[in-house]
């Protein structure tokens, strides 16, 4: 169950798609990755107030017990709902390889 | 990737399964759920530090640039792995009857 | 704006070799790889390999492999490729290709003009 | 090696016609396909990307639709200038591979 998708924090406050520019050396892959020089990363930043694209009935459970006992349950987490796949040219111990990663880049977002 | 279950910040500090015991009425379930009267939740709980039970390269990535840009890119959040089905006794229009939901209890836990 | 300006065209023997220019400029070189495509009279497109321009990492297609060199001198944006031991079936014309990458994948977006190789005694 | 098969090897149209071409993959290539334009004398142009990405400056008549083996490249008015023979390419392992081009001819 994908609940609602207003944000009651105001505008992009909310869990949502943000993309953050990073380079190999960022990225911790300049002793393995070739190409690209930089990448556009998607990654799921924002809030996940009560209800917000609840993921599920586990979700949904977390917002409540986070309600009455937020020392102890932390409120529900934005991560990714699915990937977009990418392709890396890499080092391999023969040379070079062109290599797709289907779990790389967040394609979208919900919170659990 | 299920990189390194040691946790650095010391024991049951880092992300893994906790059980938090839950009425009906915690849950805001006493409306339309007969039976259990109280739910064990298992829930993903703890921190995320670099690489611990790191669930894919999107969650390597994220641990990355959070060190970098710590204000802007959040640690990795600890989340359900997989879950445990469970059956409610619950009311319908037409009377009760016996559901089961899958996405309902953590059965293990990563970080992404 | 980008542009790929190649050398000129070369008459060769068989078993000598060639080396053609490709001169990169309107974009950072060291930011895009390099393939090169060749094209013999009348057939279709064959690509021959790709390299690096940050860190001169090559990758060569297999029926060139020992035939074939790619460099790049990133002090004049220039990328090159050097094929020996040249027999009448290479006769073609060479074309190198900005190699683009990011999320959206690979992609040759420019082009040189192409230089025609001739093998002929 | 992945082989890209592109069919037809040529097709006769009017302008205005709608044409399809269509490639196929010996194995899944997710949607890392390219398509070309080629005219006589001239080096190749970047049309799609990523299967279905149009490339900047490109007119919206060529689309591209697609993943895994099979892809079409449609052209939906043909006009004048887009004789030309088109090419598929697979990017998605090394070595790259082009299909075989498909010649659009005036009928």
């Known amino acids: 169950a994908r609940n609602g998708d207003h944000c009651p924090l105001g505008p992009g406050r909310c869990c949502r798609l943000h993309t953050v520019r990073a380079s190999l050396e960022d990225l911790g892959w300049a002793d393995w990755v070739l190409s690209p020089r930089e990448v556009q990363v998607t990654m799921c930043i924002g809030a996940c107030p009560s209800q917000f694209r609840a993921a599920n009935m586990h979700a949904q459970i977390k917002t409540s017990l986070h309600r009455l006992k937020p020392d102890t349950v932390p409120a529900p987490c934005c991560v990714p709902a699915s990937y977009n796949p990418m392709v890396l040219i890499q080092k391999t111990d023969t040379g070079v390889s062109l290599q797709t990663y289907d779990d790389l880049l967040a394609k979208d977002c919900h919170c659990i | 990737a299920r990189n390194g279950d040691h946790c650095p910040l010391g024991p049951g500090r880092c992300c893994r399964l906790h059980t938090v015991r839950a009425s009906l009425e915690d849950l805001g379930w006493a409306d339309w759920v007969l039976s259990p009267r109280e739910v064990q939740v298992t829930m993903c709980i703890g921190a995320c530090p670099s690489q611990f039970r790191a669930a894919n390269m999107h969650a390597q990535i994220k641990t990355s640039l959070h060190r970098l840009k710590p204000d802007t890119v959040p640690a990795p959040c600890c989340v359900p792995a997989s879950y445990n089905p469970m059956v409610l006794i619950q009311k319908t229009d037409t009377g009760v009857s016996l559901q089961t939901y899958d996405d309902l209890l953590a059965k293990d836990c990563h970080c992404i | 704006q980008v542009q790929l300006v190649q050398s000129g065209a070369e008459v060769k023997k068989p078993g000598a070799s060639v080396k053609v220019s490709c001169k990169a400029s309107?974009?950072?070189?060291?930011?895009?790889?390099i393939s090169w495509v060749r094209q013999a009279p009348g057939q279709g497109l064959e690509w021959m390999g790709w390299?690096?321009?940050?860190?001169?990492?090559?990758f060569y297609a297999q029926k060139l492999q020992g035939r074939v060199t790619m460099t790049t001198d990133t002090s004049t944006s220039t990328a090159y490729m050097e094929l020996r031991s040249l027999r009448s079936d290479d006769t073609a014309v060479y074309y190198c290709?900005?190699?683009?990458?990011?999320?959206?994948?690979?992609?040759?977006?420019?082009w040189g003009q192409g230089t025609l190789v001739t093998v002929s005694s | 090696d992945i082989q890209m098969t592109q069919s037809p090897s040529s097709v006769s149209a009017s302008v205005g016609d709608r044409v399809t071409i269509t490639c196929r993959a010996s194995?899944?290539?997710?949607?890392?396909l390219a398509w070309y334009q080629q005219k006589p004398g001239k080096a190749p142009k970047l049309l799609i990307y990523?299967?279905?990405s149009l490339q900047s400056g490109v007119p919206s008549r060529f689309s591209g639709s697609g993943s895994g083996t099979d892809f079409t490249l449609t052209i939906s008015s043909l006009q004048p200038e887009d004789f030309a023979t088109y090419y598929c390419?697979?990017?998605?392992?090394?070595?790259?591979?082009f299909g075989g081009g498909t010649k659009v001819e005036i009928k």
């Open positions: 390419q697979q990017v998605h392992s090394f070595p790259i591979t």
């Open positions: 390299i690096s321009a940050y860190t001169a990492d090559t």
């Open positions: 194995q899944g290539i997710d949607s890392w």
């Open positions: 990523a299967a279905s």
């Open positions: 309107g974009y950072t070189f060291t930011n895009e790889g």
């Open positions: 290709a900005r190699t683009r990458h990011d999320t959206s994948g690979l992609r040759f977006d420019y």
